[in-house]
Amino acid sequence: FEIALPRESNITVLIKLGTPTLLAKPCYIVISKRHITMLSIKSGERIVFTFSCQSPENHFVIEIQKNIDCMSGPCPFGEVQLQPSTSLLPTLNRTFIWDVKAHKSIGLELQFSIPRLRQIGPGESCPDGVTHSISGRIDATVVRIGTFCSNGTVSRIKMQEGVKMALHLPWFHPRNVSGFSIANRSSIKRLCIIESVFEGEGSATLMSANYPEGFPEDELMTWQFVVPAHLRASVSFLNFNLSNCERKEERVEYYIPGSTTNPEVFKLEDKQPGNMAGNFNLSLQGCDQDAQSPGILRLQFQVLVQHPQNESNKIYVVDLSNERAMSLTIEPRPVKQSRKFVPGCFVCLESRTCSSNLTLTSGSKHKISFLCDDLTRLWMNVEKTISCTDHRYCQRKSYSLQVPSDILHLPVELHDFSWKLLVPKDRLSLVLVPAQKLQQHTHEKPCNTSFSYLVASAIPSQDLYFGSFCPGGSIKQIQVKQNISVTLRTFAPSFQQEASRQGLTVSFIPYFKEEGVFTVTPDTKSKVYLRTPNWDRGLPSLTSVSWNISVPRDQVACLTFFKERSGVVCQTGRAFMIIQEQRTRAEEIFSLDEDVLPKPSFHHHSFWVNISNCSPTSGKQLDLLFSVTLTPRTVDLT
């Protein structure tokens, strides 16, 4: 190989060992039989050399640095050449470095031809191995603006006082042009300006200077986004840290065309603007840091540009001003991550503050809109607390557990609406009365409606799930001893059409000791399946539940248990079941931890089934499933 550098070219070539490899055979640069591992060639020198091995690219890298002095004379502006040409260099991983020094008052602009640049974060690499590392200067301090790959949105970077641009090319890469030009500009009065151009939908991730280290103290950095007017942009902060400020406040400022409040100032912890039409600027302003404990300011953010959806121009009013103790969250439904670009899906408050989740609270009227290609990617979860603190005031009081129509009119599917029903301990209990009788969901007879009610204890220490219930069954009411949560969960978009079938009334009633009582009025047409609460986990220790089963005068009920033995093994106490005729009070008692379960039995009058648990040994829980079937009486037994 021969490298000859013209005099006055201000170019230095350095060949040195790259990252050490585990290759056993070393490799040397050989110059007239001398072996070296580092070779420096300066302007005006001509050197002939070889390598002592077959694959020097596995060992060595080459750096070509050109110093451009704009202090003492005119600057060589325009397209930057690769000098010496890549064809004259050994095939090593090579880095071309341009170090431009200029006065503080001079602005320097790097212009990148297509493909534009895409910034990468620490630990990331470029698919083709071509990287652009750009740094600036504040007095004598070097500031890293960022590392970039090809195929992005960054078209121009403006700096002042100097710029260092390093273009890294892998040894096998055929590129023979720098891909950028340098222009002079007036002073930009800040650290740098990065211009990011979107031609269509897409996203860009960008970082503050020196990221992930700290942004220089009291500096200003601006990103200019060029977005076609027909598209919408949203900003989200992926990662940020705040330093300890002594004076001034760290902030981001937006210049948004058409805004009457330019610049719009946000704290880094605020929700950032979304649904912006056309071009906008974002600036990061540092502060004077505490000398003793400065901390670090850093920011990594994403700009997402996409087509406005039909929904994005519609404003929805969610009036929660008459509600109390209620919160509504619109959030992404869980989904497998896709590797290809997925347009963002945002919900916007007042059309400007957009984020992937939004929580609205009671007491106010909220205006929301959506910036989302597919609203099925979102769902709603609502929580409302109905509590009674004074038992004298609440007793016999009723509340309708109904999803408000404002919520049903939103274009987003309701997932859960949870009512937390709280009563004073040992003073009151609750009764749930559905508008339509309920069916308990079982494997034998699953619910196939578009929604269900999930009823569970709301006492933190108690793990008690009564079950899942849907309209169209035989359960007329459910009484529960203490605090519960009732969750209306939807399973299909058709819930909107079936919403009229929902309706549950809760009333506060005098306290009773049993954990739950189910009132069942079977229909003649079908078999009713019932199961103990906490199915699969077992009825909690020392818990008692009852079923009040009505039998019409002209019918006979067949009670059938679905296994021979309960399977429970008691550690302490006894588990038992009482089947009691309501008219005669005649009762049968079964020891569930000893006896076999009763064979199918026939009941001509309404009856009770009461199941009470012991403290079972782990793994030997109490789970019972039974059915009630009505058939017409054939003989009058009265």
Partner: antibody, heavy 116, light 111 residues
């Protein structure tokens, strides 16, 4: 482990010839440049010859040029030094050395005495 | 020919102290960003052993007590602290120009 073992030294009359051998093991011999270095009875070290890894390039100081020839057989992992027209000032301990970024590995040496 | 002059010719240093050996070249041994100067240690009955290559680089397996410095014509080998095992003759060698040459050696004695 890198090992270099010289042989072929001995007593020779002035004007005589001698061929030294250096058997190499523990490394890929064909990848390395080799040299001969000698140490006089006064303990002065002198570089004598250089050969590139493929054997295509050889270099000598003026003191031995035309009289000494360095060669190698990469198939046999052996380095040679053919010495002729020997002089009394060639009396020395002859070392073969592997040249990396300096003479990184040396053999134990073979003694050549030129005397009548 | 480049002549290498080592000084002192012999040196006695107490255990644990610093030993400094100098090597002066009759002309510069620097080129292409490198100083082509190497240092060797030789004990009686043994071949020389490479300690420092290209003026300041420690050969692998050599204790960090050994260090090299210098450029152009003036070079130094420093041993700090000296250990009993360091008693030997030390040579400098240049290969910037043909013929490659060695210094006359410095004999280090530990007292």
């Amino acid at each position: 482990e890198v090992q270099l073992q010289e042989s072929g030294g001995g007593l020779v009359q002035p004007g005589g010839s001698l061929k030294l051998s250096c058997a190499a093991s523990g490394f890929t011999f064909s990848s390395y440049t080799m040299s001969w270095v000698r140490q006089t009875p006064e303990k002065r070290l002198e570089w004598v010859a250089y050969i590139s890894n493929g054997g295509g390039s050889t270099y000598y100081p003026d003191t031995v040029k035309g009289r000494f020839t360095i060669s190698r057989d990469n198939a046999k992992n052996t380095l040679y030094l053919q010495m002729s027209s020997l002089k009394s000032e060639d009396t020395a301990m002859y070392y073969c050395a592997r040249y990396d970024l300096g003479f990184a590995y040396w053999g134990q040496g073979t003694l050549v005495t030129v005397s009548s | 020919n480049i002549v290498l002059t080592q000084s002192p010719a012999s040196l006695a240093v107490s255990l644990g102290q610093r030993a400094t050996i100098s090597c002066r070249a009759s002309e510069s041994v620097d080129s292409y960003g490198n100083s082509f100067m190497h240092w060797y240690q030789q004990k009686p009955g043994q071949p020389p052993k490479l300690l420092i290559f290209l003026a300041s680089n420690l050969e692998s397996g050599v204790p960090a007590r050994f260090s090299g410095s210098g450029s152009r014509t003036d070079f130094t080998l420093t041993i700090d602290p000296v250990e009993a095992d360091d008693a030997a003759t030390y040579y400098c060698q240049q290969n910037n120009e043909d013929p490659w040459t060695f210094g006359g050696g410095t004999n280090l004695e530990i007292i």
